[in-house]
């Protein structure tokens, strides 16, 4: 008799990201008898919130509802209604929500509990909203970039399934970069973590790794920006900044109340005598480069070497997966190819920084002028980071991968953060057992 | 000081709906969230759902979820629960309580002192 | 949801003794548990929040500790006006649960 295939025996669960200047949601799927293999969770979908950052809610909380409607109604139709209420859903707030909690702990308590009251409404199992620090968001990235390659997986493979992927068992290190943060993770090679805050111990399918992480909070994409226009405004002689890491011809006003209502900004505040400034790009990579590198403290280091700011950062070790922000700004710019060297991608930003705004608008007239006019300095920005904050150098250059998606399933912290909130990462290597033919009969 | 002052006992019909008001008498609601607990006759307290009146974001427990609305009037200081479809297990007193505050906050400092809501054919 | 399950029912103390009543969730709320004590035709009172912070104008006898999934309120010395059900309360996520109550009578 022919083998009639049973219904899947699947589970699903529902991690919501919410980012300092989006929230997305990503639905994974798993087959429910392999819960603690490796590799078998993957990313069925992804639908991002139209808006902003949850912390933008903070005057308009009634909103936050109807701003969650459409993807978790999204959820409600890929997830079948009979697992809807075994479904977990989880939100995990980061750096734009951490940054909201340093001004004000009720403000934040005020976005996350409306946050949770809309989310409690749906039929799935609803298991919180949660602000997570910033070790975490480091640690579960490379906990999912790894899980996603197979490098906790103890069978060797002679073939690859996946990209990147060499056939040892050297896990790689995760570097993420979001609106309000950035995070480096990974394994040191036989190196003393010198500052126990950015050491971390797993014991994850019976191999033991010692793990640095930091997260640099104000260091994302976003937050950056504001920092580098409240440092250079101190010196500008009028309302008027000429800014190398605009395009030439490139015009904006910004409000100082804008620029001064985050916590980054703090250290370069003062009295200006205007209400507002004009940004005038000027489209000069390296002096860019330049008037980024003043962000950096690097003349403070109490440990053996420091990647700025006073805080330690061991010898960069293997393979990297550079993924979020890192990932979306260099494909944006079509740099994102193994074969692209630090020097030809230095050459490239240099020639696309100095591009007339007038010209790029027209090359890139399908995006929307607040993202194209910050591709100068969020690329300018991922190199000084990468080579002067963390140390890389053009030949090591070559060990970063810019990574959006593996298997499917987008690199990032959510689906390392669902892994240990549901249990699915063993401390201890699972007993091989035959292959399950349950579901043919 | 602030009161939650709820209204009178209703005797109602299976399958009719009933309205129960809860009003803050000498003061107005803080900016935290009401939520409205029912016990039936010699049983355990029961949570319903909850609302913020300063926001009107409601939410409701899955059991009553379709079957109850609350509802708040700001300018009269009033939070309003209806539960419809009512059945004989519907009959307990319903209270109205104070969230102490936002978030992980939400513990119960202040009660009315309960609507006793009856149903009987 | 998660489920809040007290015990004893009913507990019977005589005065002056000390009287210990226990509360565990079907999964962690951390510190965010709540008690509340119900008197005969009366709203319920709280008691305790935050697992051991006692709410204003509760007297010092009444203390509470725990955290993850076990909890304990405890009464050091009952007095008389002490007899009547006990009830914890979950606030770390929706829905919000109860427990089914302890009925602390006189022994």
């Known amino acids: 008799t022919q083998n009639k295939a049973l219904p899947e025996n699947v589970k699903y669960g529902i991690v919501l990201d919410a980012g300092s200047s989006h929230t997305s949601l990503y639905i994974y799927k798993w087959p429910a008898e392999k819960e603690n293999d490796t590799g078998v969770v993957h990313q069925v979908e992804e639908c991002r919130v139209k808006g902003p950052g949850i912390s933008k809610f903070v005057q308009k909380v009634n909103e936050i509802g109807i701003y969650l409607t459409d993807c978790m109604e999204r959820a409600r139709e890929v997830i079948p209604r009979s697992q809807h209420q075994e479904t977990p859903v989880y939100l995990g707030a980061t750096a734009g929500m951490r940054l909201l909690r340093m001004e004000s702990e009720e403000l934040a308590d005020r976005v996350l509990d409306v946050v949770e009251r809309s989310l409690s409404n749906y039929p799935f199992d609803f298991q919180g909203a949660r602000i997570i620090t910033g070790q975490e968001e480091g640690a579960y990235g490379w906990i999912t970039i790894n899980y996603l390659l197979g490098k906790f997986s103890q069978k060797t493979r002679w073939f690859s399934i996946v990209p990147y992927e060499t056939n040892n068992q050297e896990t790689f290190g995760a570097l993420d970069l979001g609106g309000a943060s950035t995070q480096v993770t990974f394994v040191p090679q036989n190196q003393t973590i010198e500052s126990p805050d950015n050491a971390l111990q797993f014991r994850l399918y019976g191999k033991d790794y010692n793990v640095y992480t930091h997260s640099f909070l104000c260091y994302g994409k976003d937050q950056a920006l504001w920092q580098k226009l409240a440092k250079d405004i101190q010196v500008a002689s009028n309302e008027i900044l000429r800014d190398p890491c605009f395009h030439p011809g490139y015009k904006k006003v910004v409000n100082v109340s804008d620029l001064y209502k985050t916590p980054c900004t703090k250290r370069f505040e003062m009295t200006l005598p205007f209400q507002q400034f004009e940004i005038q790009g000027i489209g000069n990579y390296q002096q860019c480069h330049q008037s980024i590198l003043e962000l950096f403290n690097t003349s403070y280091c109490p440990y053996s070497q420091c990647a700025f700011n006073g805080i330690f950062l061991p010898p960069l070790q293997g393979d990297f997966g550079a993924f979020s922000a890192f990932y979306f700004v260099m494909k944006f710019l079509n740099l994102t190819s193994e074969k692209v060297s630090q020097e030809k991608v230095t050459e490239m930003m240099k020639k696309f920084c100095a591009q007339p705004w007038e010209e790029i608008k027209t090359s890139y007239a399908g995006v929307k002028e607040k993202y194209l006019s910050e591709y100068c300095f969020s690329g300018t920005y991922i190199l000084s980071l990468l080579l002067q904050g963390y140390h890389f150098t053009a030949d090591s250059w070559e060990h970063i991968h810019f990574i959006g998606k593996i298997q499917g399933s987008d690199a990032g912290w959510t689906l390392g953060y669902m892994l240990n909130l549901t249990n699915m990462i063993p401390a201890e290597q699972p007993l091989s057992t035959p292959l399950s033919h349950s579901t043919y009969v | 000081q602030v009161q939650l002052v709820q209204s009178g006992a209703e005797v109602k019909k299976p399958g009719s709906s009933v309205k129960v008001s809860c009003k803050a008498s000498?003061?107005?609601?803080?900016?935290?969230?009401i939520s409205w607990v029912r016990q039936a006759p010699g049983q355990g307290l029961e949570w319903m759902g909850s609302?913020?009146?300063?926001?009107?974001?409601?939410n409701y427990a899955q059991k009553f979820q379709g079957r109850v609305t609350i509802t708040a009037d700001e300018s009269t200081s009033t939070v309003y629960m209806e539960l419809s479809s009512l059945r004989s297990e519907d009959t307990a007193v319903y209270y109205c309580?104070?969230?102490?505050?936002?978030?992980?906050?939400?513990?119960?400092?202040?009660w009315g002192r309960g609507t006793l809501v009856t149903v009987s054919s | 949801e998660i489920v809040m399950t007290q015990s004893p029912a009913t507990l019977s103390v005589s005065p002056g003794e000390r009287a210990t009543l226990s509360c565990r969730a079907s999964?962690?709320?951390?510190?965010?548990l709540a008690w509340y004590q119900q008197k005969p035709g009366q709203a319920p009172r709280l008691l305790i929040y935050?697992?051991?912070t006692r709410a204003t104008g509760i007297p010092a006898r009444f203390s509470g500790s725990g955290s993850g999934t076990e909890f304990t309120l405890t009464i050091s010395s009952l007095q008389s006006e002490d007899f009547a059900v006990y009830y914890c309360?979950?606030?770390?996520?929706?829905?919000?649960?109860f427990g089914g109550g302890t009925k602390v009578e006189i022994k």
């Open positions: 935050g697992a051991s």
């Open positions: 000498g003061g107005t609601f803080s900016s935290y969230g």
């Open positions: 999964q962690s709320v951390s510190s965010n």
């Open positions: 309580a104070r969230e102490a505050g936002y978030y992980r906050y939400r513990y119960f400092d202040l």
């Open positions: 309360q979950q606030h770390a996520l929706w829905p919000l649960t």
């Open positions: 609302i913020i009146p300063q926001f009107g974001t409601a």
